[in-house]
C-alpha cells in the first residue's frame, strides 16, 4: 500500500517540487488532522505558509476563541489559518514571520521577524517575536514582550477594557497596543481616524486602517 505524502508547511511542498502558489493541504505535526492553507510560492523565494490575509472586508473577523483556534474564512481570499495549527507548527521548528502590508495610496511595506512562535492554548497562544527588520517601522507594532491572544469571548489583554470588543477582532492585544491586523475593514476615504481599524502604527500611524495585510511564515533554515 502506497503511503500518502503529507506536508507540514508550504516550504516542504515547495521543496517537493510543487512551486505554484495556491491552496494546499497541510497536516498537523504528529497527527493526521489536516488544514487547508494558501501557499505563496512567489514571494521572496517561495515556500511561505499564509496564516492571515485581509483584502476586501468580505470575511467577518470578529470571531470567537474557538473560531480563531480552528481557523475561518477561505484561503483563496480573507482568512485566518488557526492558532492551534500555527502553535503546533512553530513550537517544533524555528520559523520566521513576514507581515506584508498595503495602504490606500499604493504603497507597500513589510515587517520580518527572524524568530516567531505561538505558545499553546494553555498560555492563550501568546506570541513570541525576535529580530525585527523591514520597511514597516523600526519598532515592532506587535507589543513586546508578546501578549496573549484575546477574542470577543476570551479577554486576556492588559487593559481595564476588553480590547477585542472595543477594537473588534482577535489579536495579541496589549492595552490595547500599536497594532490589530484583524480589526474592522474600512474602504478607501473612510479609513482614517478609526478607533477599530486594521492598524500597524509604526508604519502608518494612529487611526489609519490598511487596505490589505498578509501574515506568512517559513522555516528559518529554508
Amino acid at each position: 500500500k502506497e503511503e500518502k505524502t503529507t506536508f507540514r508547511d508550504c516550504a516542504e511542498i515547495f521543496k517537493s517540487g510543487l512551486t505554484t502558489s495556491g491552496i494546499y493541504t497541510l497536516t498537523f505535526p504528529n497527527s493526521t488532522e489536516e488544514v487547508k492553507a494558501y501557499c505563496d510560492m512567489d514571494m521572496g523565494g517561495g515556500g511561505w505558509t499564509v496564516i492571515q490575509h485581509r483584502e476586501d472586508g468580505s470575511v467577518d473577523f470578529q470571531r470567537t476563541w474557538k473560531e480563531y483556534k480552528e481557523g475561518f474564512g477561505s484561503p483563496l481570499g480573507e482568512y485566518w489559518l488557526g492558532n492551534e495549527f500555527v502553535s503546533q507548527l512553530t513550537s517544533g521548528h524555528r520559523y520566521v514571520l513576514k507581515i506584508q502590508l498595503k495602504d490606500w495610496e499604493g504603497s507597500e511595506a513589510h515587517s520580518l521577524y527572524e524568530h516567531f512562535y505561538l505558545s499553546g492554548e494553555e498560555s492563550n497562544y501568546r506570541i513570541h517575536l525576535t529580530g525585527l527588520t523591514g520597511t514597516a517601522g523600526k519598532i515592532s507594532s506587535i507589543s513586546q514582550p508578546g501578549s496573549d491572544f484575546s477574542t470577543k469571548d476570551s479577554d486576556n489583554d492588559k487593559c481595564i477594557c476588553k480590547c477585542s470588543q472595543m477594537l473588534t477582532g482577535g489579536w495579541w492585544f496589549d492595552a490595547c497596543g500599536p497594532s490589530n491586523l484583524n480589526g474592522q475593514y474600512y474602504p478607501q476615504k473612510q479609513n482614517t481616524n478609526k478607533f477599530n481599524g486594521i492598524k500597524w502604527y509604526y508604519w502608518k500611524g494612529s487611526g489609519y486602517s490598511l487596505k490589505a495585510t498578509t501574515m506568512m511564515i517559513r522555516p528559518a533554515d529554508f
Epitope: K158, C159, I160, M166, A175, C176, K194, F195, S206
Partner: nanobody, 129 residues
Framework: EVQLVESGGGLVQPGGSLRLSCAAS????????IGWFRQAPGKEREGVSA????????YYADSVKGRFTISSDNSKNTVYLQMNSLRPEDTAVYYC??????????????????????WGQGTLVTVSS
C-alpha cells in the same frame, strides 16, 4: 465620521496667552479622553496635556505645569487648552487627539501616543517678539 478641529493658534509675544479649542464631532466626550500634543520643526511629537472623566482627571507635561490649563465643555463637545506665560520654546503645531477612555493599561493613568486614533489637522502657535 469622527472629526477633531483645532483653532485658536497664532502669533503671540513671550509672556502672552492663547486659548486653543478642540471641537469634536462623530462621538461624545463622555466616553473619550482628549489629549493635546505639539510638534516643533525637526522634533518628535510630544504630549502636552490630557483630560478625561468630564475633567475629573487631567495630565500635564512637566514643561507646561503651572502655565497651561486643560478643560472641557461637554455640552459643546469641545476641549480647551489655556496657555499662559508662553515661551519661545512653546512654538509648535498643536494637535488634539482622542482615545476611548477605557483603553488604559492596568495600573496606568494615561495613554501612550499610539492609542490616540483620531487626530485633528493642527493649529500653529508661534511665540516670538
Amino acid at each position: 465620521e469622527v472629526q477633531l478641529v483645532e483653532s485658536g493658534g497664532g502669533l503671540v509675544q513671550p509672556g502672552g496667552s492663547l486659548r486653543l479649542s478642540c471641537a469634536a464631532s462623530g462621538f461624545t466626550l463622555d466616553d473619550y479622553a482628549i489629549g493635546w500634543f505639539r510638534q516643533a520643526p525637526g522634533k518628535e511629537r510630544e504630549g502636552v496635556s490630557a483630560i478625561r472623566d468630564n475633567g475629573g482627571s487631567t495630565y500635564y507635561a512637566d514643561s507646561v505645569k503651572g502655565r497651561f490649563t486643560i478643560s472641557s465643555d461637554n455640552s459643546k463637545n469641545t476641549v480647551y487648552l489655556q496657555m499662559n506665560s508662553l515661551r519661545p520654546e512653546d512654538t509648535a503645531v498643536y494637535y488634539c487627539a482622542a482615545v476611548p477612555a477605557g483603553r488604559l493599561r492596568f495600573g496606568e493613568q494615561w495613554y501612550p501616543l499610539y492609542e490616540y486614533d483620531a487626530w485633528g489637522q493642527g493649529t500653529l502657535v508661534t511665540v516670538s517678539s
